[in-house]
Interface confidence: low
C-alpha cells in the first residue's frame, strides 16, 4: 500500500519531518535509511533505518494528587524491514513503573463560623443589595483543603426613596459608508455616525440630568486606494533536475505573477507560485558501517603461566567488536576491532567483603504485571587487594593502567541470615493500567 | 553505565591553592577505590593519589606533603586539595573510579579537567 514518504526522523519527539510527497511504497521511501514513512490512516512514524528501541517518554502524571502513588513511561520498538531483538517485533511497547507523590498530605475540609452582621444598603434609593460574611476557621481546613458553599450572601433591600434617573448617551450607530470609494473625486470622502439620549432617558420626576456631550460625530475617511489591478500568473518554467543522487527527491516548477503585477492594493495571483514532482533515482543510498557493542573480556592469562589467580602477576585480556550494517558503498568503521588491557585475576578469589548501604529503591516490577513491587538490596562487596594499580611491561612503553578481572567470592558476616545479598521488597501503590498512547489519542 | 564527573581545574601562580572535585554516580552499588591521575603533554599518565572505601591513602613522592585526598563514601565523591603548586603540576588531571559488585569489577575514568600553574 502507498504510504507518506518524509526526510527526516526526529527521535526525540518520535515524528516525520519533511513531507516529501505520498504515493510510494515503503520499500521505495525505505531506499533511503534517513527517511521515514507512515501510514496514510494517521498511524505511527516509522524510520527508515533497522529497528530499535525509540527514546523513553516523559513520565506518566502520578495516578493520584496525593500521597504516593505510581506512574509509568514507554517505549516503542520502532523502524523498518525486522525487529528490534528476538520476539519483540516493530511497534512492541516496553514499560516501566515507578513510585511518585505529588503531595504529601490530602486536603481536609474546614469548616465555616457563625454568620457576621448584615452590612448597611448598598444604596441610597430605590432597592439595593446587602451582604454578610463568615469565616472559614472553624475549624481551618488542612493541606490545601477549603470550606463547602459561600464566604458571603447577600439579599435585597429596599430604602423606600425613589431615585433620579439621569440621561446616558446609548451605544454609538454604526459608521455611516464612505461617500466615495477612491481618492481623487470631485467631494473629499467622509463617514457619519449618531447616538442616542435613551439608555436611558432622563427623568422628569425628580429630574435627571441630561446627557453631555454631541449626538453626532463626523470624520475624514483615510487609506482609500488608488483603483486596484488584479494580478495574473505567467508561464511555468522548466523543470529542475533531480536533486539526489539515490533513493527518492524532488522537482520544482516556478511561475511569477507578472502578467500583469497586482498594483494599488489589487489582489494578487492566487494559487501557488510552485509546485513540485517526486523523481526516483531508484538507486539505493549509501549506508555506513556502524560498531556493534564490544564483546566480552576474555580471561585474563600471562604466557606460559597455567594460572595467574589470586596472584599479584598482571595478565592480559582482549575484547572484539563487529562492523555490522555497511551496505552499498557506505564507509567502513573508523577505528580499532580489537581491545587489550592489563589485568589482575580475582576470579574465584575468596576476598574479605563488606556490607554495602542499601541501594535505593528500583522500578516496580513486573509494570503491567499484577501485584507490582520495588526492592532494594544489601551486597556483600569484596575488599580489593592492594596491587599496584600500574605496571611497566616493556621497556620504553611506560606505565600501562592495570583493571581486577573476575567474579570473586567475598565473605561477610552473616546478616539477617545471608551471606551475599540482602534484599527488602515493598508493594507499590495505585498502579494505573498500561495502555496504548496511540491508542489513548482515538 | 556510571558517569564519572571532574571540576575545579583551573589557572594558579606558582604557590597557589586549588580543589579539585569529582563524582561517581548511576547504577552504582559502592566504589571501593577512587583515585586521582594526571598526564602532562607528551608523558604517561601517573597516579598522584588514591583513597580506598575505608580512607587508606597513597601518595606519589612528587606530591606528599602538598596534596590531601578525601572521600565521601556515602555521596560517592573524592576531593584532592592541593597546596604549594609548582609549575611541574601542570597537567590534565582525571578521576578514576573502581566499582565492585556482585557481577564483577570494573574501572571508570571522567574526561579530565585542565590544571596549569604558571610562573
Known amino acids: 500500500d502507498p504510504v507518506l514518504c518524509f526526510t527526516q526522523y526526529e527521535e526525540s519527539s518520535g515524528k516525520c519531518k519533511g513531507l516529501l510527497g505520498g504515493g510510494v511504497s515503503v520499500k521505495d521511501c525505505c531506499l533511503n535509511t534517513a527517511y521515514a514513512y507512515q501510514e496514510r490512516n494517521g498511524g505511527l512514524c516509522q524510520p527508515c533505518r533497522s529497528p530499535r528501541w525509540s527514546l523513553w517518554s516523559t513520565w506518566a502524571p502520578c495516578s493520584v494528587t496525593c500521597s504516593e502513588g505510581s506512574q509509568l513511561r514507554y517505549r516503542r520498538c520502532v523502524g523498518w524491514n525486522g525487529q528490534c531483538s528476538e520476539r519483540v517485533a516493530l511497534g512492541t511497547l516496553e514499560w516501566q513503573l515507578q513510585a511518585c507523590e505529588d503531595k504529601q498530605c490530602c486536603p481536609e475540609m474546614g469548616g465555616w463560623s457563625d454568620w457576621g452582621p448584615w452590612e448597611p444598603c448598598s444604596v441610597t434609593c430605590s432597592k439595593g443589595m446587602r451582604t454578610r460574611r463568615r469565616a472559614c476557621d472553624h475549624p481551618a481546613p488542612k493541606c490545601g483543603g477549603h470550606c463547602p458553599g459561600e464566604a458571603q450572601e447577600s439579599e435585597a433591600c429596599d430604602t423606600q426613596q425613589v431615585c433620579p434617573t439621569h440621561g446616558a448617551w446609548a451605544a454609538w450607530g454604526p459608521w455611516s459608508p464612505c461617500s466615495g470609494s477612491c481618492h481623487g473625486g470631485p467631494h473629499e470622502p467622509k463617514e457619519t455616525r449618531s447616538r442616542t439620549c435613551s439608555a436611558p432617558e432622563p427623568s422628569q420626576k425628580p429630574p435627571g440630568k441630561p446627557c453631555p456631550g454631541p449626538a453626532y460625530e463626523h470624520r475624514k475617511c483615510t487609506g482609500l486606494p488608488p483603483c486596484p489591478v488584479a494580478g495574473g500568473w505567467g508561464p511555468w518554467g522548466p523543470v529542475s533536475p533531480c536533486p539526489v543522487t539515490c533513493g527518492l527527491g524532488q522537482t520544482i516548477e516556478r511561475r511569477t505573477c507578472n502578467r500583469p503585477v497586482p498594483q494599488h492594493g489589487g489582489p494578487s495571483c492566487a494559487g501557488d507560485a510552485t509546485r513540485t514532482h517526486i523523481c526516483n533515482t531508484a538507486v539505493p543510498c549509501p549506508v555506513d558501517g556502524e560498531w556493534d557493542l564490544w564483546g566480552q573480556w576474555s580471561t585474563c592469562v600471562r604466557r606460559n603461566m597455567k594460572s595467574i589467580s589470586c596472584e599479584e602477576i598482571p595478565g592480559q585480556q582482549s575484547r572484539w567488536r563487529t562492523c555490522k550494517g555497511r551496505k552499498f558503498d557506505g564507509h567502513r568503521c573508523t577505528g580499532q576491532q580489537q581491545d587489550i588491557r592489563h589485568c589482575y585475576s580475582i576470579q574465584h578469589c575468596p576476598l574479605k567483603g563488606s556490607w554495602s548501604e542499601w541501594s535505593t529503591w528500583g522500578l516496580c516490577m513486573p509494570p503491567c504485571g499484577p501485584n507490582p513491587t520495588r526492592a532494594r538490596q544489601r551486597l556483600c562487596t569484596p575488599l580489593l587487594p592492594k596491587y599496584p594499580p600500574t605496571v611497566s611491561m616493556v621497556e620504553g612503553q611506560g606505565e600501562k593502567n592495570v583493571t581486577f578481572w573476575g567474579r570473586p567470592l567475598p565473605r561477610c558476616e552473616e546478616l539477617q541470615g545471608q551471606k551475599l545479598v540482602v534484599e527488602e521488597k515493598r508493594p507499590c501503590l495505585h498502579v494505573p493500567a498500561c495502555k496504548d498512547p496511540e491508542e489513548e489519542k482515538l | 553505565q556510571v558517569q564519572v564527573v571532574e571540576s575545579g581545574g583551573g589557572l594558579r601562580q606558582t604557590g597557589g591553592s586549588l580543589r579539585l572535585s569529582c563524582t561517581a554516580s548511576g547504577r552504582i552499588f559502592e566504589v571501593n577505590m577512587m583515585a586521582w591521575y594526571r598526564q602532562a603533554p607528551g608523558k604517561q599518565r601517573e597516579l598522584v593519589a588514591e583513597i580506598s572505601r575505608v580512607g587508606t591513602t597513597v601518595y606519589a613522592d612528587s606530591v606528599k606533603g602538598r596534596f590531601t585526598i578525601s572521600r565521601d563514601s556515602a555521596k560517592n565523591t573524592v576531593t584532592l586539595q592541593m597546596n604549594s603548586l609548582k609549575s611541574e603540576d601542570t597537567a590534565v588531571y582525571y578521576c578514576?573510579?573502581?566499582?565492585?559488585?556482585?557481577?564483577?569489577?570494573?574501572?571508570?575514568w571522567g574526561q579530565g579537567t585542565q590544571v596549569t600553574v604558571s610562573s
Open positions: 578514576n573510579a573502581l566499582q565492585y559488585d556482585r557481577y564483577g569489577g570494573a574501572e571508570y
